[in-house]
Interface confidence: low
């Protein structure tokens, strides 16, 4: 199946710069004088707003308003061509993409526009491909596409297991959602056997019981946010601050080097994720304790960046795992320290998960293709792709983003092996709430 949505492939052109140009809006950043207590709230709001504006500003001219394909030419500005165009071979012209055939979403120096996605059978075309926006495909009614298995639409379940009620309908991007009647916690187990299934019609509303669970969840999340603010002001904040290196005030990598359309999670998301991962205490489901936790932490409990993406989804909170923050043992640069460990990852991550992992981390298909071509040998492929990821995302390439991507892919063993390896190598240690000692 061809790539779609956020994973739309990049044309190669083999030029060094594939991200958007300077004109690509990246969202406002709080200035240094903004009180730290406001940062979390402001960041969350900005992320929501910037996500919305990214969709709104992608509006396109109607086909009849465009010049004939490949005829409209203009000169590049600072070496970049505007959305809906690509650069000519000699770098002198910007050539229009072909309507309905290819597109480009950002200011770019691509030698080719990106091919439009063609919706598979089992999908409906939500919006056609324009010169600045790829086709939007959606699963047909009654089916959905999970982020973990984007290659096909899967049939939605017809009902929930016994003792659970449906709180979410089947949508093109998610299966029905079931929660336990009593606790209101989400069901994350396997699809139940038919005889255990309690069927319900698409329109069945959530029971008052489960609604109260959701309300409690929202309240808990709000309380947690307030607690987080106070933690910011505590001694822990001083402990964490060197690691954040100005994340709260908008420091970090150059956001203009990150192609937001392909970054998952986005650069801005990572900033929020990293903050929340330090501040957010959570519960660990008993069945996951063995796999996830080699040793019981004595310090601060944390939420992983991937899990913190669901901060606004209280029902998800029950599923999240407790996470201790991995930091460089020698207080070096976290990204550079991580880079030094890449060599061994090929032995720790199953081969079949290399590409899904890199896509999850935001590499485009063509970047993966080029990385594989550049690799010195088969074993070197993952290393090359990871280096490409670091070069692309800069300081946003954190160890937690990597671990969470593995978690999302279901590669928990690989995640645990990498975590153990980072600790045993002596390059990383767990950040403790009241001690500096590394834990392994």
């Amino acid at each position: 199946m061809e790539q779609r949505g956020q994973n739309a492939p990049a044309a190669s052109g083999a030029r060094k710069r594939h991200g958007p140009g300077p004109r690509e809006a990246r969202g406002a950043r709080p200035g240094p004088r903004v009180p730290k207590t406001l940062v979390l709230v402001v960041a969350a709001v900005l992320l929501l707003v910037s996500a919305e504006s990214a969709l709104i500003t992608q509006q396109d001219l109607a086909p009849q308003q465009r010049a004939a394909p490949q005829q409209k030419r203009s000169s590049p500005s600072e070496g970049l061509c505007p959305p809906g165009h690509h650069i000519s071979e000699d770098g002198r012209d910007c050539i229009s993409c072909k309507y309905g055939q290819d597109y480009s979403t950002h200011w770019n120096d691509l030698l080719f526009c990106l091919r439009c996605t063609r919706c598979d059978s089992g999908e409906v075309e939500l919006s056609p491909c324009t010169t600045t926006r790829n086709t939007v495909c959606q699963c047909e009614e009654g089916t959905f596409r999970e982020e973990d298995s984007p290659e096909m639409c899967r049939k939605c379940r017809t009902g929930c297991p016994r003792g659970m009620v449906k709180v979410g309908d089947c949508t093109p991007w998610s299966d029905i959602e079931c929660v336990h009647k009593e606790s209101g916690t989400k069901h994350s187990g396997e699809v139940p056997a038919v005889e255990e299934t309690v069927t319900s019609s698409p329109g069945t509303p959530a029971s008052p019981c489960s609604l109260s669970g959701i309300i409690i969840g929202v309240t808990v999340a709000a309380v947690v946010l307030i607690v987080a603010v106070f933690v910011c002001k505590s001694l822990l904040w001083k402990k964490v601050l060197p690691y954040l290196k100005g994340i709260c005030s908008g420091g970090g990598g150059d956001p203009e080097r990150v192609d937001r359309s392909s970054q998952r999670p986005g650069a801005e998301d990572n900033v929020l994720n990293e903050i929340v991962s330090i501040l957010q205490p959570t519960q660990v489901p008993e069945q996951e304790m063995e796999v996830q936790e080699p040793a019981e932490p004595t310090g601060v409990n944390m939420l992983s960046p991937g899990e913190s993406e669901h901060l606004l989804e209280p029902a998800e909170a029950e599923r999240s795992q407790r996470r201790r923050l991995l930091v460089p043992a020698n207080e070096g640069d976290p990204t550079e320290t991580l880079r030094q460990c890449f060599d061994d990852f090929a032995d720790l991550v199953p081969f079949d998960s290399w590409e899904p992992l890199m896509r999850k981390l935001g590499l485009m298909d063509n970047e993966i293709k080029v990385a594989k071509a550049e690799a010195a040998g088969h074993r070197d492929t993952l290393y090359t792709m990871l280096i490409k990821w670091v070069n692309k995302t800069g300081r946003d390439a954190s160890v937690h983003t990597l671990l969470d991507a593995l978690e999302t892919l279901g590669e928990r063993l690989a995640k645990q092996k990498i975590e153990d390896h980072l600790l045993s190598s002596g390059k990383f240690m767990y950040l403790e709430g009241n001690a500096d000692s590394a834990m392994s």
């Epitope: 190669s12 990106l114 091919r115 088969h378």
Partner: antibody
């Protein structure tokens, strides 16, 4: 456009280098492949080079006998230990440079005859 | 190594008929398959890439489809100009070597 050159009649064991010359585009932006076709037979992939980094991939039957390299405007196929089985028309092909593998530009081919 | 099995090796169809050529991959290659047309004395010409996408300036009577590891090239309303040999090229771009494999070819004769 692409043009292959260097094909000729050689005796078994004689080394031979074929050259693929590009005009109208920069080779360093593309994956370039070599493909051959024995008389009356099908197409056979030899290998390719990603000219941006000079990384190469080969078919296993090549077994180190063939080497692909590049300059700024050419891609070379250096052949050693030639046998009569290597008699074929050799094509070079350019990948479109998109995310997909699509060899959309081919040279006319150059004939190599290995005979004693 | 990736092996592409192409069938039939030759087929004959009257003008206006439909030609169907199949290629079976020995392993999963996703949609990384392209189709090429070659006439005698000429280099191959790209028809279809990523299993079903039509290359530029290729007539719409050519179409490609995929079902798992089986790929199909269909020529609807075949014309005299379509008389040629057709090849599929499967690509397993994860494996460094033996990543590309052509099918054996199908000769299409138009009556």
């Amino acid at each position: 456009s692409l043009e292959e050159s260097g094909g000729r009649l050689v005796t078994p064991g004689t080394p031979l280098t074929l050259t693929c010359t590009a005009s109208g585009f920069t080779i360093s932006s593309y994956h370039m492949s070599w493909v051959r076709q024995a008389p009356g037979k099908g197409l056979e992939w030899i290998g390719y080079i990603y000219a941006g980094s000079a990384s190469t991939w080969y078919a296993s039957w090549v077994k180190g006998r063939f080497t692909i390299s590049k300059t700024s405007t050419t891609v070379d196929l250096k052949m050693t230990s030639l046998t009569t089985e290597d008699t074929a028309t050799y094509f070079c092909a350019r990948d479109a440079g998109s995310s997909y593998w699509e060899f959309n530009l081919w040279g006319p081919g150059t004939l190599v005859t290995v005979s004693s | 190594a990736l092996v592409m099995t192409q069938t039939p090796s030759s087929t004959s169809e009257p003008v206006g008929g439909t030609v169907t050529i199949k290629c079976q991959a020995s392993q999963s290659i996703g949609s990384s398959l392209s189709w090429y047309q070659q006439t005698p004395g000429q280099p191959p010409k790209l028809l279809i890439y990523t299993a079903s996408s039509l290359a530029s300036s290729v007539p719409k009577r050519f179409s490609g489809s995929r079902s798992g590891t089986q790929f199909t090239l269909t020529i609807s309303g075949v014309q005299c100009a379509d008389a040629a040999t057709y090849y599929c090229l499967g690509i397993d771009d994860v494996r460094r070597d033996d990543g590309f494999a052509f099918g054996g070819g199908t000769e299409v004769v138009v009556k």
